[in-house]
């Protein structure tokens, strides 16, 4: 009997393995070399959303595309080989410390030449997956004493970027204290970044499991061919059907002039480290990219005079500075941006169960993306929050928050 792999169906160096097919026959499964994916490894991943890193291994967006950030001692596109090992080798033994989350490693005679004995609460070949929800009802306390001093210094210290450490006191989560605080299912923060549907985490409170349970999950990014075009033509008054998708930001509602607005509750407030005039010059691109990330429509909130509510954000002045120095005009280092969320098309789409009902839930989602290093947004965000009521008077925003 010919092996289903005889015809070498896997492209781009993917490994073919026979597997049981329907009706008892044999078919094949391709194990793709990154960044390729698809049934025959025929597609190239253009974003982390499309790249299948081994469970527990984070994906990083690099200038050359998405890459799996292998743990120390492992390398290769799928983090299965030693640095310097021949291509295709999968001989990661205990020397490479392959067991994650405190698991202990034992050598084994067969590939991959190791076996992990996992610590409590973890499972999988490399202890990469959380076991059934542990008995403990809360995340462990912050294990590193040094993290206390680093909280709130506006730098994301990776070693403190965990729920127990409050995501480095919010420094890694855009100042959102705990993006998953409303989520009753424990461990959802761990599963948020795994590109797999985890039904227990797919509720609004658990931030929709990063849309992993949404139809077509891995293909839900704006087609790179359209991306620049859609940003240029966002909210330009003409309907571009190629951009009129949730993953491309609904074309700035250009195709929805007859559909009544459906605003989410509250105002989404972002501090962006670009001065207002610079931000407003690229406002269509800014709003299109953010709308695409949130899969709904964003626009500037207008003040009573019909002007976009984009206010200067000044460099915080240390309290110890001499009074005369403080009275000089403070340096504008960014913008405080107030946005409305219009769910008219999100709620009209066939699966309308993934819209953000209020600004705070959208802020939590952005904070979560930032915490797991998956916020693919070219504008430097300092913090994000939802304001439930009327925002304060503009003058308030001319000072440090």
């Amino acid at each position: 009997v010919l092996s289903p792999c005889e015809s070498q169906p896997c492209q781009h160096g993917g490994q073919c393995r026979p597997s049981p097919g329907p009706g008892g026959g044999l078919t094949f499964t391709c194990h793709c070399a990154q960044p390729f994916w698809g049934p025959r490894c025929e597609r190239v991943a253009r974003s982390c959303r499309e790249l299948q890193c081994p469970v527990g291994v984070p994906c990083q967006q690099t200038p050359r595309g998405p890459r799996c950030a292998c743990p120390p001692g492992l390398s290769g596109p799928s983090c299965r080989s030693f640095p310097g090992s021949p291509p295709g080798a999968s001989n990661a033994s205990c020397a490479a410390a392959p067991c994650l989350h405190g698991g202990s490693c034992r050598p084994a005679p067969l590939a991959p030449f190791f076996r992990c004995a996992c610590a409590q609460g973890w499972t999988g070949p490399r202890c990469e997956a959380p076991a059934a929800a542990p008995e403990v009802s809360e995340e462990p306390r912050c294990p590193r004493a040094a993290c206390q001093a680093k909280r709130g210094d506006q730098r994301c210290d990776r070693e403190c970027n965990s729920p127990g450490c409050g995501w480095d006191g919010g420094d890694c989560s855009l100042s959102v204290g705990d993006p998953w605080r409303q989520c009753e299912a424990l461990q959802c923060w761990r599963l948020f970044n795994n590109s797999r549907c985890d039904p227990a985490c797919s509720s609004p409170a658990c931030l929709y499991d990063n849309f992993d349970c949404h139809a077509g999950g891995r293909e839900r990014t704006c087609n790179p061919v359209y991306e620049k075009y859609c940003a240029d033509h966002f909210a330009d008054g003409r309907c571009d059907q190629g951009c009129n998708t949730e993953e491309c930001g609904w074309d700035g509602l250009d195709c929805a002039s007859e559909v009544p607005a459906l605003l989410a509750r509250g105002v989404l407030v972002l501090t962006v480290l670009l001065p207002p005039e610079e931000l407003l010059r690229s406002s269509a691109d800014f709003l299109q990219r953010l709308s695409a990330i949130l899969r709904t429509s964003l626009r500037f909130r207008l003040d009573a005079h019909g002007q976009a509510m984009v206010f200067p954000y000044h460099r915080p002045s240390p309290g110890s500075e001499p009074r005369a120095r403080r009275e000089l005009a403070p340096e504008v280092i960014g913008s405080v941006v107030m946005l409305e969320i219009d769910n008219r098309l999100c709620l009209q789409s066939p699966e309308n169960d993934h819209c953000f009902p209020d600004a705070q839930s959208a802020a939590d989602y952005l904070g979560a993306l930032s915490a797991v290093e998956r916020l693919d947004f070219p504008y430097p965000l300092r913090d994000v929050r939802g304001e439930p009521l009327e925002p304060p008077e503009p003058s308030h925003h001319h000072h440090h928050h």
């Epitope: 309907c239 195709c255 406002s283 500037f300």
Partner: antibody, heavy 119, light 107 residues
């Protein structure tokens, strides 16, 4: 009904300035992208520029011959579109039209106002 | 900038004739093309948007076709009120540009 009415045209010397207005009525002006188009006497149509709504930052785009000299702005509280024209040249002589951009096309035009640049 | 070239620049036709005007873009503009009719002393009037969509209120004798770089406006049976100048216009990318116009005159 939906209407656009331009005003402010007239005779101006080369190097001078002029501000055209376009008063809108019959629709929610603030939500629309608005355009200026001009037509020199006996010639074809030429796109001048556009402005997005303020909810999307009021971004402006211009045709190369007017970039740096003309400025499009809007006052949503007055339902009015403006075209500020500085450093005018004789080749800017034209009828200037304002137009509303609908979701799929530019569907409403004003009647036009004539600007003559001559010494 | 995207150049739009119309042909012919003028034509003479009789009532009842089938008239075809073509428009060529210097690069692909997908279906982002509009056709306008303008009569002397009046503002342009939109006939066709997005290459082939008839604007509401426009008689069905007007039709548009094409995509990419080559487009056509057809008047199936010319009527007296159709004698005017016709312009194509791309709104694929700013600066939006018009063709130089085609004047349809009575033979």
């Amino acid at each position: 009904q939906v209407q656009l009415v331009e005003s402010g045209g007239g005779l101006v010397k080369p190097g001078g300035s002029l501000r055209l207005s376009c008063a809108a009525s019959g629709f929610t002006f603030s939500t629309y992208v608005m355009h200026w188009v001009r037509q020199a006497p006996g010639k074809g149509l030429e796109w001048v520029g556009r402005i997005r709504s303020n909810t999307y930052g009021g971004i402006t785009d211009y045709a190369a011959p007017v970039k740096g000299r003309f400025t499009i702005s809007r006052d949503d509280s007055k339902n009015t579109l403006y075209l500020q024209m500085n450093s005018l040249k004789t080749e800017d002589t034209a009828v200037y039209y304002c137009a509303r951009a609908e979701a799929r096309y530019r569907d409403v035009w004003g009647q036009g106002t004539l600007v003559t640049v001559s010494s | 900038d995207i150049q739009m070239t119309q042909s012919p620049s003028s034509l003479s036709a009789s009532v009842g004739d089938r008239v075809t005007i073509t428009c060529r873009a210097s690069q692909s503009i997908s279906s982002h093309l509009n056709w306008y009719q303008q009569k002397p002393g009046k503002a342009p009037k939109l006939l066709i948007y997005a290459a082939s969509n008839l604007q509401s209120g426009v008689p069905s004798r007007f039709s548009g076709s094409g995509s990419g770089t080559d487009f056509t406006l057809t008047i199936s049976s010319l009527q007296p009120e159709d004698f005017a100048t016709y312009y194509c216009q791309q709104d694929y990318h700013t600066p939006f540009t018009f063709g130089q116009g085609t004047k349809v005159e009575i033979k």
